[in-house]
């Protein structure tokens, strides 16, 4: 079969000339190849300099293909992170706006005078969500204490409440024994709902961000000496041999690429990470609904105020007993009691059937649906990466042309060595390059740990807890559906059975870089748009 290999370098000169190589360095006909370091030391079209340059180019081609194949992962996770982050922040703004409108309408001037407390609450909720704030328990306890300090004196305009009295009042209100519950059960219910939801939202957007960062790092593949030489033998040496149109055999490519990627894969942590995102997303549009939580902040605060008003005699008696009787205000200094409606009339929020929609015209329901569609394309990406790379026309002959002769590494023919799997155990027997059998390299281990940490955080948040120490699951009943998700988790939101893989496609790119990605199989990873 070797006799069929051309003795001319015309094809090679044409290909390399088009790539900007000096034709002075490429002989018109094959020369002796004793000077070659990587390619077979037979007849060749390559000088030492050409071989060295081709080694660098083949590395770059491989690196570029890996990055292109995974670019859709990076773009999708980045776009989803941006959309969810914008959505959550906008929902907090919508909640603040509707609280302002409703309280202005219900409490009039009273609200206007004390709006800073409410604005402060939302500011601290945003800080917590954005990871810069203190714990939610403290934030909410402070809010209710401040509210009590402002509202309690309004219930008793005949008394004077100096700062030290108000300090006693707020200490009493926030004491852990719960002896004084001026706002009834509203603070506890608001804390549970807000904590579960914000912890889940924060874990979710952090999870998307971690995934994006991990993937973009993992796609920057360092090429070892052994991998570099194998890549050269795979796609560089046919040029040196004078047969640039002879494509490498598919099995040869798979062995080389799997060897080069052997310590880089993120499975099974990748699949678990995707499951974590999906389960937590489900929680955020179901039992931990961010929209309902945002809507209900005003309702819960209003309920607390109504409780205080309706139980003011009992609450006041407790306060006066613990903090002492307040001093009466001299008659001439006494303010007229506020009009009845300003002291707070019963107010209930109008419930809308339609889910809240942001200015961008989206809602969480739609965002979660879109997320599922896009994550479905990501499943199995790392496991299939070698097939995707070898599906590119620069890397190997079309897998469907199995019977046709191809470049074996030595010449034209059929590739006879066994094609090994991608696991470290199988890679020990890789015929094309020596692979370290000790498993993932250090950077990959670190990345897998990052994915595991993000997954653990999402798993914990999906069960109503905060990995950073806050426990949001005081009453496990929540708004229903709790245990089902725990079971889903244990089962691991399993992917449906795999379809036969389709032949991988070369990466596609558009100007924005938002599309692209490698080949795919139905029910597996595929090309995807960033959005």
């Amino acid at each position: 079969s070797e006799a069929k290999v051309t003795r001319s370098c015309a094809e090679t000169r044409q290909v390399l000339g088009a790539r900007g190589y000096s034709l002075n360095l490429i002989p018109p006909a094959l020369i002796s190849g004793e000077h070659l370091r990587v390619c077979p030391q037979e007849y060749t079209c390559c000088s030492s300099e050409t071989e060295q340059r081709l080694i660098r180019e083949t590395e770059a081609t491989f690196r570029g293909l890996v990055e292109d194949s995974g670019s859709f992962l990076v773009h999708t996770l980045a776009a989803r992170h941006r959309k969810f982050d914008e959505f959550f922040l906008e929902m907090l703004s919508v909640a603040q706006h509707s609280l302002t409108q409703l309280f202005s309408h219900s409490y009039g001037r009273l609200y206007a005078q004390h709006a800073l407390i409410f604005n402060g609450l939302f500011s601290r909720l945003r800080d917590f969500y954005g990871e810069s704030g203190e714990g939610l328990d403290d934030t909410l306890a402070d809010f209710w204490a401040q509210l009590l300090e402002r509202v309690f004196p309004l219930l008793h305009p005949q008394y004077s409440f100096p700062p030290d009295y108000l300090l006693c009042l707020s200490r009493l209100a926030s004491s852990t024994d719960g002896s004084l519950q001026p706002f009834g059960d509203s603070p506890r219910r608001l804390r549970l709902q807000i904590t579960r939801t914000l912890v889940a939202a924060r874990a979710f957007v952090q999870g998307l961000e971690t995934g994006r960062n991990v993937v973009s790092e993992a796609l920057k593949v360092p090429v070892s000496e052994g991998c570099s030489q194998a890549l050269m033998r795979l796609i560089g040496c046919p040029l040196c041999r004078g047969v640039p149109s002879l494509m490498p055999c598919q099995g040869f490519c798979l062995n080389v690429v799997r060897g080069c990627l052997s310590s880089r894969g993120l499975e099974p942590d990748w699949g678990n990470y995707l499951d974590g995102l999906l389960i937590l997303a489900d929680k955020l549009q179901g039992p931990f609904s961010f929209e309902l939580t945002a809507e209900s902040i005003g309702v819960k605060i209003s309920e607390g105020l109504m409780y205080l008003q309706e139980n003011s005699a009992k609450v006041s008696a407790q306060v006066f007993q613990e903090c002492g009787p307040p001093d009466p205000v001299p008659a001439r200094n006494r303010r007229a009691p506020p009009p009845r409606e300003e002291a707070g009339r019963l107010w209930s929020m109008v419930t809308e059937e339609e889910r809240p929609t942001t200015a961008a015209g989206t809602n969480l329901h739609r965002l979660v649906w879109e997320l599922r569609e896009r994550l479905a394309r990501m499943r199995g990406f790392w496991a299939r990466l070698s097939l995707t790379v070898c599906g590119d026309s620069r890397m190997a002959a079309d897998a469907s042309l199995e019977a046709a002769p191809c470049w074996t590494g030595a010449g034209r023919g059929r590739y006879l060595p066994p094609v090994v799997g991608g696991s470290p155990a199988e890679q020990v027997n890789n015929p094309e390059l020596k692979v370290d059998a000790s498993g993932p390299d250090v950077p990959t281990r670190r990345r897998r740990l990052q994915l595991r940490a993000a997954t653990a955080r999402m798993k914990t948040a999906a069960l109503g807890h905060d990995l950073d120490g806050q426990d949001a699951d005081e009453d496990a009943s929540g708004s229903g559906g709790g245990q089902q998700y725990a079971d889903d988790w244990m089962a691991g939101a399993v992917a449906p059975p795999a379809r036969p893989p389709r032949p991988p496609y070369p990466p596609r790119r558009d100007g924005s870089g938002g599309k692209g990605g490698g080949g795919s199989a139905r029910y597996n990873q595929g090309r995807s748009r960033s959005g």
């Epitope: 489900d282 599922r372 569609e373 394309r377 559906g481 992917a495 449906p496 139905r522 595929g526 090309r527």
Partner: antibody
């Protein structure tokens, strides 16, 4: 393999509620990652997606029908159902149930059931 | 909603002809597009998924291509059993929408 079968009355009076059930055999309706969907086709016309229910219970409806549609699942019977209220003659169609996986087509489909709205 | 416009709405071709149907989306849907075949009195049958991938068991004379907003469905050599109505369907965004269909007949 998985099979779907629609059932329900073939004739419904205007202003009443159309109720259909899809029975799933050869697989569990509570398997994760699946959407259970309803699609309809008026006589001689094209296909219209009505809505889907995800295995976790989230529902997704076509905005053009949203105010009248309810899709629910009964895991104990391995069935899911469609209710369409206040029907008119324009709701006369062949109603199909189908399964869908995130990121993938409707597959398989039921064979369809014709529902006529007439007094 | 994303509108899917199929053309032509009907066409007549001879056995062995190459037949092409186009589908245009009102906005970019990447390759989130499927093609179905529906014969009279039957449920639709999936032929092509993700714009260009042949469903298992579907004859290789059927193919699909395109990305973004413009998609093409091709039958390389028309056979008598291909008489049917063909639909494209997008799932990039809610609501899921179908093209209005292309009715294919034999001359």
């Amino acid at each position: 393999q998985l099979q779907l079968q629609e059932s329900g009355p073939g004739l419904v009076k205007p202003s009443e509620t159309l109720s259909l059930t899809c029975t799933v055999s050869g697989g569990s309706i509570s398997s994760s990652s699946y959407y259970w969907s309803w699609i309809r086709q008026p006589p001689g016309k094209g296909l219209e997606w009505i809505g889907s229910i995800y295995y976790s219970g989230s529902t997704y409806y076509n905005p053009s029908l949203k105010s009248r549609v309810t899709i629910s699942v009964d895991t104990s019977k391995n069935q899911f159902s469609l209710k369409l209220s206040s029907v008119t003659a324009a709701d006369t169609a062949v109603y199909y149930c189908a399964r869908r996986v995130s990121g993938h087509p409707f597959d398989p489909w039921g064979q369809g059931t014709l529902v006529t709205v007439s007094s | 909603d994303i509108q899917m416009t199929q053309s032509p709405s009907s066409l007549s071709a001879s056995i062995g002809d190459r037949v092409t149907i186009t589908c245009q989306a009102s906005q970019d849907i990447s390759d989130y597009l499927n093609w179905y075949q529906q014969k009279p009195g039957k449920a639709p049958k999936l032929l092509i998924y993700d714009a260009s991938n042949l469903e298992t068991g579907v004859p290789s004379r059927f193919s699909g291509s395109g990305s973004g907003t413009d998609f093409t469905f091709t039958i390389s050599s028309l056979q008598p059993e291909d008489v049917a109505t063909y639909y494209c369907q997008q799932y990039d965004n809610l609501p899921i929408t179908f093209g209005q269909g292309t009715k294919l007949e034999i001359k």
